[in-house]
Amino acid sequence: APVRSLNCTLRDSQQKSLVMSGPYELKALHLQGQDMEQQVVFSMSFVQGEESNDKIPVALGLKEKNLYLSCVLKDDKPTLQLESVDPKNYPKKKMEKRFVFNKIEINNKLEFESAQFPNWYISTSQAENMPVFLGGTKGGQDITDFTMQFVSS
């Protein structure tokens, strides 16, 4: 069976939207009005992995682009990157672990924990227009809570 996907946008808990600053990097910043069109639309695929009531494994692709968020070690540090894939083969139910995030729902907020690196989360800075990154701390200065907005296909 084909993998189930939905289109959505994400905003951090400070209401910053995610935009592409280039082919390989997402940034978080406040957008208003027409500028909201700039925000990235994700194709969130529900993939194979450890699942529970509040934890669902997903892959985050960029809609209509052969790019997926992935988690790799760079200079011995877990790092978030945009990785290009062959669109003929993706998305798939059994995604490689670097592409998998545990979508965790707590109090109507979402966290995205790397399946490859437990306790590392998709994060944004308090500051405006900074890269989205993989952070190893929750509840500190960096933001790990998001809300999801559904987008019609």
Epitope: S21, G22, P23, Y24, E25, E64, N66, S84, D86
Partner: antibody, heavy 123, light 107 residues
Framework: EVQLVESGPGLVAPSQSLSITCTVS????????VHWVRQPPGRGLEWLGV???????DYNSALKSRLSISKDNSKSQVFLKMNSLQTDDTAMYYC?????????????????WGQGTSVTVSS | DIVMTQSQKFMSTSVGDRVSITCKAS??????VAWYQQKPGQSPKALIY???NRHTGVPDRFTGSGSGTDFTLTITNVQSEDLADYFC?????????FGAGTKLELK
């Protein structure tokens, strides 16, 4: 053999719109992105935008309000439409295939280029 | 926008020489740089991708190096068919931007 062939009107009157078609062979538009680049006479290259294999687009923000890139995978054609042309839009317009190094995070340059189509904006 | 500066508009060389063409990015572009060769009346031809990798069929006298902000295209044992314009491209950030080009000519 990978080939890209641009076809355009040649001459466009000021304030009119430009439509160029890029017909490709030797690769699939559903798997490869295609860029548009232009080069004014005697000048350097300027990136206009890209259409991804999946159909998404990204544009040069300086031209975004005037540009539209689309494609028809079944006909192996990519289309560039540009509105409100002025004399400084006179250039050679190229389409170029995106490098596809899957698994790379820096996969967004061009490998094969078309021969270009010359566009002159003049009344 | 990221500015790619090719400070030498022209470079004079002789057949058999070694020549280095430089390109400087206004900010860190990692290794997201490509080099292109363009001969008069022709479209650009891809030489180097990801700063240092030769495209298929490109002679090994062409070598790319650099990362971050400083990049070099080196041609060893220059041949007459190498006389052309050379452009660098950064593809780290939108909009993708090219250097203004360096014209390689005979002394």
């Amino acid at each position: 053999e990978v080939q890209l062939v641009e076809s355009g009107p040649g001459l466009v009157a000021p304030s009119q719109s430009l439509s160029i078609t890029c017909t490709v062979s030797g690769f699939s538009l559903s798997r490869y992105s295609v860029h548009w680049v232009r080069q004014p006479p005697g000048r350097g290259l300027e990136w206009l935008g890209v259409i991804w294999g999946g159909g998404g687009t990204d544009y040069n923000s300086a031209l975004k309000s005037r540009l539209s890139i689309s494609k028809d995978n079944s006909k192996s054609q990519v289309f560039l439409k540009m509105n409100s042309l002025q004399t400084d839009d006179t250039a050679m317009y190229y389409c170029a295939r995106n490098t596809n190094y899957y698994g790379s995070t820096y996969d967004h340059a061009m490998d094969y280029w078309g021969q270009g189509t010359s566009v002159t904006v003049s009344s | 926008d990221i500015v790619m500066t090719q400070s030498q508009k022209f470079m004079s060389t002789s057949v058999g020489d070694r020549v280095s063409i430089t390109c400087k990015a206004s900010q860190n572009v990692r290794t997201a740089v490509a080099w292109y060769q363009q001969k008069p009346g022709q479209s650009p031809k891809a030489l180097i991708y990801l700063a240092s990798n030769r495209h298929t069929g490109v002679p090994d006298r062409f070598t790319g190096s650099g990362s971050g902000t400083d990049f070099t295209l080196t041609i060893t044992n220059v041949q007459s068919e190498d006389l052309a314009d050379y452009f660098c491209l950064q593809h780290w950030n939108y909009p993708l931007t090219f250097g203004a080009g360096t014209k390689l000519e005979l002394k």
